[in-house]
């Protein structure tokens, strides 16, 4: 799947919305590589 | 309220180099990818790179072929676009940008660096 | 490098009309496609992203679609705020690559 910065950005805001953002304060797009998905 | 605040227009001479900032503000700098644009007139948007303001790890687009140099000052929320060994064609407006997700999801742009490239 | 290909590079169209805009890429780029919208002396304005997903305070009349290479930005009913140059990006590989622009002007 795609690993660009611009990839990992709107996989995690999708991430955070279906979660209700309940997740580790540290999981922002610089903080997460393409393992996080 | 997020805002990308960059620094003025520049003239520079063939052969010189330009540095151009980006101030962030409204939101955590270091969690969002800084990605640096440019325009020349008349042409379309080229993506010249982009850097992880918490690793500072950059990608650029090899078009330029090293002579540019993205950096970030983590202290100051400011990301940095330096351009080398600068020709007429690289008279241009030269943007920043970053997709945000907190607090509002969207993909923020600076309002522009015109840079002059002339003799 | 991925080559985004836009047609038409212009248009002339009236406020209240469907007008659709169309992208290709050189090769597979999924849904990583983003559309943005540019007036004069202006920083781009982000649409779209995700080839179908509007941002938040995007107008619905704003729509995109497509996956693979074939891209779509669709605007269901003109407004005069629309008249701009409108330009599609991919984000799936390094160097990002945008469209050559698509003008939209008043008939």
């Known amino acids: 799947s795609c690993n660009t910065a611009t990839c990992v950005t709107h996989r995690l805001a999708g991430l955070l919305s279906r979660s209700g953002g309940v997740v580790k304060d540290n999981f922002v797009p610089t903080n997460v590589g393409s393992e996080a998905f | 309220e997020v805002q990308l605040v960059q620094s003025g227009a520049e003239v520079k001479k063939p052969g010189a180099s330009v540095k151009v900032s980006c101030k962030a503000s409204?939101?955590?700098?270091?969690?969002?990818?800084m990605n640096w644009v440019r325009q020349a007139p008349g042409q379309r948007l080229e993506w010249m790179g982009d850097i992880n303001p918490n690793s500072g790890g950059t990608n650029y687009n090899q078009k330029f072929k090293g002579r540019v140099t993205i950096t970030v000052d983590k202290s100051a929320s400011t990301a940095y676009m330096e351009l080398s060994s600068l020709r007429s064609e690289d008279t241009a407006v030269y943007y920043c940008?970053?997709?945000?997700?907190?607090?509002?999801?969207?993909?923020?742009w600076g309002q522009g660096t015109t840079v002059t490239v002339s003799s | 490098d991925i080559q985004m290909t836009q047609s038409p590079s212009s248009l002339s169209a009236s406020v209240g009309d469907r007008v659709t805009i169309t992208c290709k890429a050189s090769?597979?780029?999924?849904?990583?496609v983003a559309w943005f919208q540019q007036k004069p002396g202006k920083a781009p304005k982000s649409l779209i992203y995700?080839?179908?997903y509007r941002y938040s305070g995007v107008p619905s009349r704003f729509s995109g679609s497509g996956s693979g290479t074939d891209f779509t930005l669709t605007i269901s009913s003109l407004q005069p705020e629309d008249f701009a140059t409108y330009y599609c990006q991919q984000y799936n590989n390094y160097p990002y690559t945008f469209g050559g622009g698509t003008k939209v002007e008043i008939k």
């Open positions: 995700s080839a179908s």
């Open positions: 090769q597979n780029v999924d849904t990583n």
């Open positions: 940008a970053s997709i945000i997700i907190v607090p509002n999801y969207f993909d923020y």
């Open positions: 409204g939101y955590t700098f270091t969690d969002y990818y």
